[in-house]
């Protein structure tokens, strides 16, 4: 069976600088040439779009300039990085993959990556 399934890690811990990275991998049947990747955040039963990018296979993944996401693509694998995260951004981040071309359109949704963000403790003043 070559039906598309989206795989992503269950849990990721953001760095002290508020950066979280994870891989979104999709088993794509056929050879899609245009793929859209969207990151959704689910918290308190509400789903919001974090960022989205469309890319042509073989080209680089490009998010909007003001996006908090960056990423690279390699075959059926997308390496996603989300920046500027704070403790209040802790939640389930879902990778949505759409095969836009050639038809027919196809949608795959991952189970989500729980990203934990811990705000760093403020540094105490040093007295030398």
């Amino acid at each position: 069976c070559k039906a598309m399934h989206v795989a992503q890690p269950a849990v990721v811990l953001a760095s002290s600088r508020g950066i979280a990275s994870f891989v979104c991998e999709y088993a794509s049947p056929g050879k899609a040439t245009e793929v859209r990747v969207t990151v959704l955040r689910q918290a308190d039963s509400q789903v919001t779009e974090v960022c989205a990018a469309t890319y042509m296979m073989g080209n680089e993944l490009t998010f909007l300039d003001d996006s908090i996401c960056t990423g690279t693509s390699s075959g059926n694998q997308v390496n996603l990085t989300i920046q500027g995260l704070r403790a209040m951004d802790t939640g389930l981040y879902i990778c949505k993959v759409e095969l836009m071309y050639p038809p027919p359109y196809y949608l795959g949704i991952g189970n989500g990556t729980q990203i934990y963000v811990i705000d760093p403790e403020p540094c105490p003043d040093s007295d030398f």
């Epitope: 056929g30 050879k31 469309t54 071309y101 050639p102 038809p103 027919p104 359109y105």
Partner: antibody, heavy 114, light 108 residues
């Protein structure tokens, strides 16, 4: 409910022109290529051509048998696509469908006869 | 263009399983889609990407693809399944879709 609603069609004389319309609703129309497929009486499905999405510059491709006679275009602001058929022949008689392959219009009969 | 070969007709008794084949050179390397076409109605996508069912399509419809043959299976066939069935792939060389010739399914 996702819909592709077609209009146009009917009886036309050989050598004349006809334009079919296809209006989409309740799906990401502007993201998807819109194809036209026909079925002549007693025959199978035949893909005629398509207009790709804006991501591809709304470029078009056609099957050899209609290239130069048929033109496909779209206006995403109106969620509509067209099939302009010129220099029609009797063997263009068929039911014509617009489609994204996930979704299909209801079909419209074009009869080319003198 | 790749050539997709389907049997012109398949007959099956009610309640049995219908199998409709779609042959093509190394078709397993392609994504195969299946459409149901009833007289006077628009085609309906019943299986896409070899084996997935769009929403609203009964579980009785399934698909597989290996070697040089893709297969559409319809289990517990009933009279409402009588239709023409078409396989389709996307030809990457020409960037165009290709349909099989279609198979008329008759429920005895």
């Amino acid at each position: 409910e996702v819909q592709l609603v077609q209009s146009g069609g009917g009886l036309v004389q050989p050598g004349r022109s006809l334009r079919l319309s296809c209006r989409g609703s309740n799906f990401n129309f502007d993201d998807l290529a819109i194809s036209w497929v026909r079925q002549a009486p007693g025959k199978g499905l035949e893909w005629l051509g398509f207009v790709r999405s804006k991501a591809y510059g709304e470029t078009t491709d056609y099957v050899a048998s209609v290239k130069g006679r048929f033109t496909i275009s779209r206006d995403d602001s109106k969620f509509i696509a067209w099939l302009q058929m010129d220099s029609l022949k009797t063997d263009d008689t068929a039911v014509y469908y617009c489609t994204t392959f996930n979704y299909w219009g209801q079909g419209t009969l074009v009869t080319v006869s003198s | 263009l790749p050539v997709l070969t389907q049997p012109p007709s398949v007959s099956v008794a009610p309640g049995k399983t219908a199998r409709i084949s779609c042959g093509g050179n190394n078709i397993a390397s392609e994504a195969v889609h299946w459409y149901q076409k009833k007289p006077g109605q628009a085609p309906v996508l019943v299986i896409y990407y070899d084996s997935d069912r769009p929403s609203g399509i009964p579980e009785r419809f399934s698909g597989s693809n290996s070697g040089n043959t893709a297969t559409l299976r319809i289990s517990r066939v009933d009279a409402g399944d009588e239709a023409d069935y078409y396989c389709q792939v996307w030809d990457r060389t020409t960037d165009q879709p290709v349909f099989g010739g279609g198979t008329k399914l008759t429920v005895l």
